[in-house]
């Protein structure tokens, strides 16, 4: 699987999850988030060669098409597969509010 | 929606579904498929600027991060959203077999 366990331990040029730390205030301008100050959102990148973690029959077909037609511009792209939520703390007035934001952290990637 | 209705009628540079005809025999080497000879598989391509059909909170966050950090390599990618099956006819010996292959045709795209 193209997950953090594999990708963070290997120098992988092809589609894999990459570490990306986002600071809420500096990188997003979200000054209202109290905790955490930032988090590892991660991202997916790298080429999708033939059969690399193909998501659907279409991505398999497109990968094969690309192999047999190397000049083609149509190819699968490396995108998030498994995402996890992130729990944040912020204030509504003086009232603390804990909220879980869904799909915030990329744990693995796929070629789609 | 970034679907065939919209994308095929507009000269859209950003993420959209693009027409791609695949000939089973010539482009894939699938000589065994009797009918159809080929089909419009289509594909997704084009940049994913901030908030363009963002798929998840993560892709929204990544798009915003990219806007505020233009030099960053992390950005959402244009990939299939809705896929449709394709019905094919092939022969097992002399027995005709009609089969529906799932997720063969891209109908719309998203930024993921």
């Amino acid at each position: 699987a193209l997950d953090t366990n594999y990708c963070f331990r290997n120098l992988e040029e092809n589609c894999c999850v990459r570490p990306l730390y986002i600071d809420f205030r500096q990188d997003l301008g979200w000054k209202w988030v109290h905790e955490p100050k930032g988090y590892y959102a991660n991202f997916c990148s790298g080429p999708c060669p033939y059969l690399r973690s193909a998501d659907t029959t279409h991505s398999t077909v497109l990968g094969l098409y690309n192999t047999l037609n190397p000049e083609a511009s149509a190819s699968p792209c490396c995108v998030p597969q498994d995402l996890e939520p992130l729990t944040i703390l912020y204030y509504v007035g003086r009232t603390p509010k804990v909220e879980q934001l869904s799909n915030m952290v990329v744990k693995s990637c796929k070629c789609s | 929606a970034l679907d065939t209705n919209y994308c095929f009628r507009n000269l859209e540079e950003n993420c959209c579904v693009r027409p791609l005809y695949i000939d089973f025999r010539q482009d894939l080497g699938w000589k065994w498929v009797h009918e159809p000879k080929g089909y419009y598989a289509n594909f997704c391509s084009g940049p994913c600027p901030y908030l363009r059909s963002a798929d998840t909170t993560h892709s929204t966050v990544l798009g915003l991060y990219n806007t505020l950090n233009p030099e960053a390599s992390a950005s959402p990618c244009c990939v299939p959203q809705d896929l449709e099956p394709l019905t094919i006819l092939y022969y097992v010996g002399r027995t005709p077999k009609v089969e529906q292959l799932s997720n063969m045709v891209v109908k719309s795209c998203k930024c993921s």
Partner: antibody, heavy 121, light 111 residues
């Protein structure tokens, strides 16, 4: 160079299941049908079924009474054959073999080395 | 199912001589202008190896000593001249009808 490398020999009890793998290399895995063939000791060849890796489409020989399941993992270019409810008469060498590519049912141009399955108490 | 009957079941031929193996199908295996009959060689402890496809076409890398002929229900594999390395069991296979079937095999021994 086209290669089909099968998993090691297995000893199973009657009633159990066995899953044999066939790892391929040297060709486009999603372009050709993959066949499975049984050869009982000192006997001839029996075609069990086939799978098309790109779509997962399958065709089975009724002789195996729905006990055979063929699957693939395209990310590793590996085909699998699972035989359930093993009987003593299932003791055999099992081969994966690539179809020639012109038809679904076809001549088989490349074969794995075979996996011996023994069903014994 | 199409039954393929191979004769003889075993064959002893002297080196340098001609060996002929017959395969008879219970019904025609011809369609679309092709004869869907193929021949394989299997040596002891090895997987089968494709020799002849579509009745008469020599598979790449197979010596020209091997040839195939026939149509409809009657097919022949010929080895001429026979060499010591040809000691093996030979199988015919049809794919004109589902299920794909093999003959019972012909074992070639040294005379």
């Amino acid at each position: 160079e086209v290669q089909l490398v099968q998993s090691a020999a297995e000893v199973k009890k009657p009633g159990a299941s066995v899953k044999v793998s066939c790892k391929t290399s040297g060709y486009s895995f999603t372009t050709y049908w993959m066949n499975w063939v049984q050869q009982a000791p000192g006997k001839g060849l029996d075609w069990m079924g086939q799978i098309f890796p790109a779509s997962g489409s399958t065709n089975y020989n009724e002789m195996f009474e729905g006990r055979v399941t063929l699957t693939v993992d395209t990310s590793t270019s590996t085909a699998y054959m699972e035989l359930s409810s093993l009987r003593a008469e299932d003791a055999a060498v099992y081969y994966c073999a690539r179809g020639d590519g012109n038809y679904a049912l076809d001549a088989m141009d490349y074969w794995g080395q075979g996996t011996l399955v023994t069903a014994s108490t | 199912d199409i039954v393929l009957t191979q004769t003889p079941a075993s064959l002893a031929v002297s080196l340098g001589q001609r060996a002929t193996i017959s395969c008879r199908a219970s019904e025609s295996v011809d369609s679309y202008g092709n004869s869907f009959m193929h021949w394989y060689q299997q040596k002891s402890g090895q997987p089968p190896k494709l020799l002849i496809y579509l009745a008469s076409n020599l598979e790449s890398g197979v010596p020209a000593r091997f040839s195939g002929s026939g149509s409809r229900t009657d097919f022949t594999l010929t080895i001429d001249p026979v060499e010591a390395d040809d000691a093996a069991t030979y199988y015919c296979q049809q794919n004109n009808e589902d299920p794909l079937t093999f003959g019972a095999g012909t074992k070639r021994n040294d005379a």
